[in-house]
Amino acid sequence: SIPWNLERITPPRYRADEYQPPDGGSLVEVYLLDTSIQSDHREIEGRVMVTDFENVPEEDGTRFHRQASKCDSHGTHLAGVVSGRDAGVAKGASMRSLRVLNCQGKGTVSGTLIGLEFIRKSQLVQPVGPLVVLLPLAGGYSRVLNAACQRLARAGVVLVTAAGNFRDDACLYSPASAPEVITVGATNAQDQPVTLGTLGTNFGRCVDLFAPGEDIIGASSDCSTCFVSQSGTSQAAAHVAGIAAMMLSAEPELTLAELRQRLIHFSAKDVINEAWFPEDQRVLTPNLVAALPPSTHENLYFQ
Amino acid sequence: GAMGQEDEDGDYEELVLALRSEEDGLAEAPEHGTTATFHRCAKDPWRLPGTYVVVLKEETHLSQSERTARRLQAQAARRGYLTKILHVFHGLLPGFLVKMSGDLLELALKLPHVDYIEEDSSVFAQ
């Protein structure tokens, strides 16, 4: 049966036993800046092109043991959430991966900047259709990272990022605080903000909307046919990247402002229990859970 | 995220190092009255001191970025400091990434075309 997260983003009139928009997002390229990925996993084979871009810091600790499946875990799962054959949102989207996070899931602002610059140069060398850039990472507020995101957005690229998993104001983190970036918080199957250990999803006025981000089934790098459940604002951002890819594939001329407006318009309103947020943040945090449009032009999204 | 917000720095630290009057032998002095600023991550454990992104003013060309980076290296060498240019940015933002001692920040902030300098910091999978 359909995983809860795919059901949640699917308008009721399209719900069936399975979620299957076969070519959703086929005109769009999604760039993923994350860990290395297992690109030939059955769920994503042929859908993800691993670029030769790699800019990661060394792993911490003298006795760190580099295990391939662990190194690939985060990125493989997210690639599956965006475009996986069976558990992905935009099953027609093609992806390109850049490695900016090491085997411990750690990267640098400078490495991310160089990755964003790589994307811009690729776009100039070989202009394609609409581009979505997924940044499932967060660091402290960074003027330079936000500035780079702004420049890329002004070049027509849609950037989607994780709000952060610090149960804190997203405005204190980057790229979540960049105004031009679509910043995504995480909710669960009960439309509650996601709790992650002692922390949880970030919130506040720098968040644009929420999306499923708890117990999300996706490709596991443990084996070529394995699936695993992961949680976080990265998973939530991957849903929105997939939805954005489907919207842009249906309407390639959409501007960033129009896309943002559509994402908000088609979101489920006032379903999140705001009591979870600090009192002073409740009015500032958008009560929106992302969903696909219940398009009257069915073929736009589901052909 | 969330368009329409003011650009808020939150806890973000901004250290403004005022420019001294003597130009330290620079051929091209920065425009009168402009102050390049230094930024670093407010979360101490995430800081990566020793690596800095030198961001140049918007219209700076690649050749000027390279020249500014070389000038920093030359001036640092005169003071007995080794520096390494790790990357020259162009396409999105003009500037360069440099590995150097924090002692050289004041010098770097006085270079021509410099808009601001940011200390590198960590980002994490979410």
Partner: antibody, heavy 115, light 109 residues
Framework: QVQLVQSGAEVKKPGASVKVSCKAS????????ISWVRQAPGQGLEWMGW????????NYAQKVQGRVTMTTDTSTSTVYMELRSLRSDDTAVYYC????????WGQGTTVTVSS | QSALTQPASVSGSPGQSITISCTGT?????????VSWYQQHPGKPPKLMIY???NRPSGISNRFSGSKSGNTASLTISGLQAEDEADYFC?????????FGGGTKLTVL
């Protein structure tokens, strides 16, 4: 263009081993693994297993597990399938195909097991 | 015994439409979006005609279409032509492997 080129026909005695090669070209090798499929004379298709061109991981069908070994040589973009302890019912055409999706196939290698 | 059940043979006249069924369980056909159909002419390797239930690879005629309902997938060939005479195999993911149907011989009368 995307191509999978296999090694030539083999005749083997029962109990022997056979090693079939499959050279891939024309695509990003790490984006797909290689599946091996066999077809006995006049019969249907049987999936034997898969190997990752990315990290060499394998996934073997239960029926041949323990007798089959798939390996990869990334320097030559070649994948190998070795089947040991051959029996007469292993007589078949052996195909390599791209990925689990099997969208591109090699020309096939006939393996005859006969005493 | 193949894991997926197909009719041994079907036939049709030129111009007609035919449908080949492929029945599995909810552990294969019913559980995944990844049902494929292959055409095989004698002495040749199989050729992918439909992937992921209903998608056609580039270069495949739109006379070929695929669908799925529950645990049964179907391949429909419309406007039957002489060159469509061949064996047709379905395949599906299972949790850890791949399974094929036993094959259907299509005869164009």
């Amino acid at each position: 263009q995307v191509q999978l080129v296999q090694s030539g026909a083999e005749v083997k005695k029962p109990g022997a081993s056979v090693k079939v090669s499959c050279k891939a070209s024309g695509y990003a090798l790490t984006s797909y693994g290689i599946s091996w499929v066999r077809q006995a004379p006049g019969q249907g298709l049987e999936w034997m297993g898969w190997i990752s061109a990315y990290n060499g991981n394998t996934n073997y069908a239960q029926k041949v597990q323990g007798r089959v070994t798939m390996t990869t040589d990334t320097s030559t973009s070649t994948v190998y399938m070795e089947l040991r302890s051959l029996r007469s019912d292993d007589t078949a055409v052996y195909y390599c195909a791209r990925g689990y999706g099997m969208d591109v196939w090699g020309q096939g290698t006939t393996v005859t097991v006969s005493s | 015994q193949s894991a997926l059940t197909q009719p041994a043979s079907v036939s049709g006249s030129p111009g007609q439409s035919i449908t080949i069924s492929c029945t599995g369980t909810n552990s294969d056909v019913g559980g995944y979006n990844s049902v494929s159909w292959y055409q095989q002419h004698p002495g040749k390797p199989p050729k992918l005609m439909i992937y992921e239930v209903s998608n056609r690879p580039s270069g495949i005629s739109n006379r070929f279409s695929g669908s799925k309902s529950g645990n049964t997938a179907s391949l429909t060939i419309s406007g039957l032509q002489a060159e469509d005479e061949a064996d047709y195999f379905c395949s599906s993911y299972t949790s850890t492997s791949m399974v094929f149907g036993g094959g259907t011989k299509l005869t164009v009368l």
